[in-house]
Each structure stands twice: as structure tokens, then as C-alpha cells.
């Protein structure tokens, strides 16, 4: 008789999840010499240990501590790029500007990017059918707690000038419910971070508005200001040109506003 299985509202664990995590770990450690000491089997065991046999609505940051310890990585604290609702462009940027890093350019972020996972209470099975949805089911699910944990640590590590890429096409350019709005912005350390610089990415070609005057951007400045961190904001009117100019900064068209 098949065991009754909890039906959650979100998609189930990504197929071939263990193999994917392990393969990504091997690939990352091969590409990044500073992480060659990492034992990927131990990383997988620690990852698995964070959620296997645990109720997927009762996961804590503590569950991920063994994984955090194994994945400890030093990135230049003054080269951090945060992003909100504009992941692809942020990743395209750091692929070109190799000395800057998003969370997904670190080992732990790279391992989990775009993946879903959860287990079941009291069984060693991975649930490939469904996993809890943050809104409809619970916020303390394996995926949400993982990203909250690594995002907090990433923001805490930042120093000097921290950049954040924001999506100017959205109704809430700065959204308090995003990982940036709910976790990262509150975990920047004022004793280390001097300035938060927002890059607001425009969507339409004819969009010449100053989105740095958007009320949600002023809201972001207000939050940051109380923590004694300076705030600056730039409109990126032409993201395509912006990327092109990062690749070829000496191009004559790159002196004008992008």
C-alpha cells in the first residue's frame, strides 16, 4: 500500500537533484583554484543533511550551518553585486566584469541556482512530486531558508561600495518582499559599508524617466540612511549598451550616458 504523501503547492525537487549538485560542485572547484580543497561528497552530504528526514516547513538556518562551513569562501568584499528581479543581466554583467561577484558566482549560490528541493519528515526520501510554496504553504521551507541564509552571509561580508541591480520595469523597483528587500539590505554592515549604489535598469528603449526618483527607491534610501550608509543611484537607460560598454569600455559611444 503506497504511503500517503503530503501534497504541497510548489513544484517538487528538481530531477536528478543529487547528481546536479555534485556535478556543479566538481565543476566549480575545477574552475576556481581557491576552492580546490573542497570535498564535493562532503558538501553534498552536508546539503542533504540540511533537509532530508526533516519536515519541509520546519527548516532553520541552523540546519544549513554544516553546509555553510564547508562552503566558506572569501570574495573581495568591495566587489559585491546584489540584484533584485533582474538575475540574468546581473549574471551577464559579472561574466564580463570578472572581478565582480553575485551570490551565484560563489560556490553555494552556484550549487543551488534555479534548483528546488525538499524532503519528508522521518523518511530519507527526496520529494520529487511537490515542495512547499513560500506564500501558499510556509516560509521556513528548505529552499527559502537556504537563500535567506546565504544571502544574509553574503550581505554581511560586503564592504566599501556595494552595488545592487534593480529592475526598473517592475511596479515596485525596490520590493520589500524580495530577498534584497527583506534580507540583504538589512544585513549590510554600516561599519564596513560606506555606500550602496543602485543601478536601475530600464526596460523600454524610449524610457527616459529618472527612475531614481521612484518612490520605492526613495524608500530604499530612507532605510539605508538610518543605518548611516550613503546611497547613490544611477539609471541604466540602455542595458544592452551598458553590457557592451563593460566589454569594450574604450568604445567611443561609451562616454555618453547609458
Amino acid at each position: 500500500v503506497p504511503r500517503w504523501r503530503q501534497q504541497w503547492s510548489g513544484p517538487g525537487t528538481t530531477k536528478r537533484f543529487p547528481e546536479t549538485v555534485l556535478a556543479r560542485c566538481v565543476k566549480y572547484t575545477e574552475i576556481h583554484p581557491e576552492m580546490r580543497h573542497v570535498d564535493c561528497q562532503s558538501v553534498w552530504d552536508a546539503f542533504k543533511g540540511a533537509f532530508i528526514s526533516k519536515h519541509p516547513c520546519n527548516i532553520t538556518e541552523e540546519d544549513y550551518q554544516p553546509l555553510m562551513k564547508l562552503g566558506t569562501q572569501t570574495v573581495p568584499c568591495n566587489k559585491i553585486l546584489l540584484w533584485s528581479r533582474i538575475k540574468d543581466l546581473a549574471h551577464q554583467f559579472t561574466q564580463v566584469q570578472r572581478d565582480m561577484f553575485t551570490l551565484e558566482d560563489t560556490l553555494l549560490g552556484y550549487l543551488a541556482d534555479d534548483l528546488t528541493w525538499c524532503g519528508e519528515f522521518n523518511t530519507s526520501k527526496i520529494n520529487y512530486q511537490s515542495c512547499p510554496d513560500w506564500r501558499k504553504d510556509c516560509s521556513n521551507n528548505p529552499v527559502s531558508v537556504f537563500w535567506k541564509t546565504v544571502s544574509r552571509r553574503f550581505a554581511e561580508a560586503a564592504c566599501d561600495v556595494v552595488h545592487v541591480m534593480l529592475n526598473g520595469s517592475r511596479s515596485k523597483i525596490f520590493d520589500k518582499n524580495s530577498t534584497f528587500g527583506s534580507v540583504e539590505v538589512h544585513n549590510l554592515q554600516p561599519e564596513k559599508v560606506q555606500t550602496l549604489e543602485a543601478w536601475v535598469i530600464h526596460g523600454g528603449r524610449e524610457d527616459s524617466r529618472d527612475l531614481c526618483q521612484d518612490p520605492t527607491i526613495k524608500e530604499l534610501e530612507s532605510i539605508i540612511s538610518k543605518r548611516n550608509i550613503q546611497f547613490s543611484c544611477k539609471n541604466i537607460y540602455r542595458p544592452d549598451k551598458f553590457l557592451q560598454c563593460v566589454k569594450n569600455p574604450e568604445d567611443s559611444s561609451c562616454t555618453s550616458e547609458i
Epitope: K172, P215, T216, E219, S222, R227, N228
Partner: antibody, heavy 118, light 109 residues
Framework: EVQLLESGGGLVQPGGSLRLSCAAS????????MNWVRQAPGKGLEWVSA????????YYADSVKGRFTISRDNSENTLYLQMNNLRAEDTAVYYC???????????WGRGTTVTVSS | QSVLTQPPSASGTPGQRVTISCSGS????????VNWYQQLPGTAPKLLIY??QRPSGVPDRFSGSKSGTSASLAISGLQSEDEADYYC???????????FGGGTKLTVL
Amino acid sequence: EVQLLESGGGLVQPGGSLRLSCAASGFTFSDYEMNWVRQAPGKGLEWVSAISITGSWTYYADSVKGRFTISRDNSENTLYLQMNNLRAEDTAVYYCANYKSYYGMDVWGRGTTVTVSS
Amino acid sequence: QSVLTQPPSASGTPGQRVTISCSGSRSNIRNNLVNWYQQLPGTAPKLLIYNTQRPSGVPDRFSGSKSGTSASLAISGLQSEDEADYYCASWDASLNAWVFGGGTKLTVL
């Protein structure tokens, strides 16, 4: 002239409700985070609540959490404080004040008096 | 009991310099915005100092400083019109709240 004007105070019995208003003029209300601060008779200042520019974020002192609700109407340039289940210890002058980034609460109203007594 | 600690009273004679201290913690004064407010008898508070700066219109007799988890307000060349209550305030990142000191009553003798 930059001005904040509170209204809605009065005498109310314990367990009762009041709604305070704060009308802003002379500045762009929708550019500022807003606050309520109170002062009990003969006592110091106590921050009560704050609301962000768009109203997305609200903050409350532990002493009023679950009883008071802050809100704003940017089209009417007005800040509100809905006070329910009032207690004797809520008796105070209630001030509204804006928050200017990197400065602090730089414009204050004259205050409205709330008395909770049976 | 206030999150920020101030002496309840301070005094000085005209022309003197007085200092009012404000003690807090890492989650407020050390890392976040610090303000000083002046409240003259029967009036609303007025912003006097933000961090260590003076808003326009505040005499340069008033100055603010900050060291670690403590802040100080100094008033030089004390005048009779400086007799008022003085409050320190700071954003507390742990509480997600503004916190005030208990206030210091300044008497000009």
C-alpha cells in the same frame, strides 16, 4: 510654510478607540517617511510608529504592537494612527514628525492630546 | 526604562560649556543615525543635531560627537534660552525602531 497639524485627540475610556490624523503642508509629503512620537505627562519622548514613503513598510514600538495601526494617504497629504484597545498608559501628547533621510525627524507638529481614563 | 541612557539633569552658568552624554549599543548608536532634539518648555521637539552635523538655523554653540556606542551633545557659551529638555535618539537596527534617551533637563543657573 512647512507644517504638520495633528487632530483627533480627546478623552476616551480604557478599551476604547481613537483615530489621529496629521495634515502635512509646505513640503512634498510623499517623499518622506512619517512617524508618530508621544510624550506622557511629565515624561520623556517615546517613539510609537513609522511608515515608509509608499506605505509598504510599517514599524511599531513593542508597547503598541497589535493595538495601533499607522497608515497614510499620499493623495491627501495625511498621516493616520488608528488606536484600539486604549490603556491608561497611552495617555500622552501625540506628535507626528517626518523623517528626512540622513537628518532625522526634522519637522514636528504641535501635538494632539489623548487622555485614556474612566 | 529607555534603550538609550542619558543623565536626568545637567546644569551650568551662562557662558559655560556643558556636555550631555548618551549611551547605547552596537545596534543603535555605534552603527546608525544619531539625533539630538531640544524641547523648550511647552513646545514640540526640534531637531538640533544629526550625527555630528547641525541643521541650518542651529547656532554653532551646539555640537555633537560620537564614539563607539556613546554620543555626546556639547553646548558652549551657555545662554538662558538653552534651558530645555534634550533628547538623544537613534535608529535601532535590531528592534527596527527609533529609540530615545530618557531626556536630560538642562538648567541654566
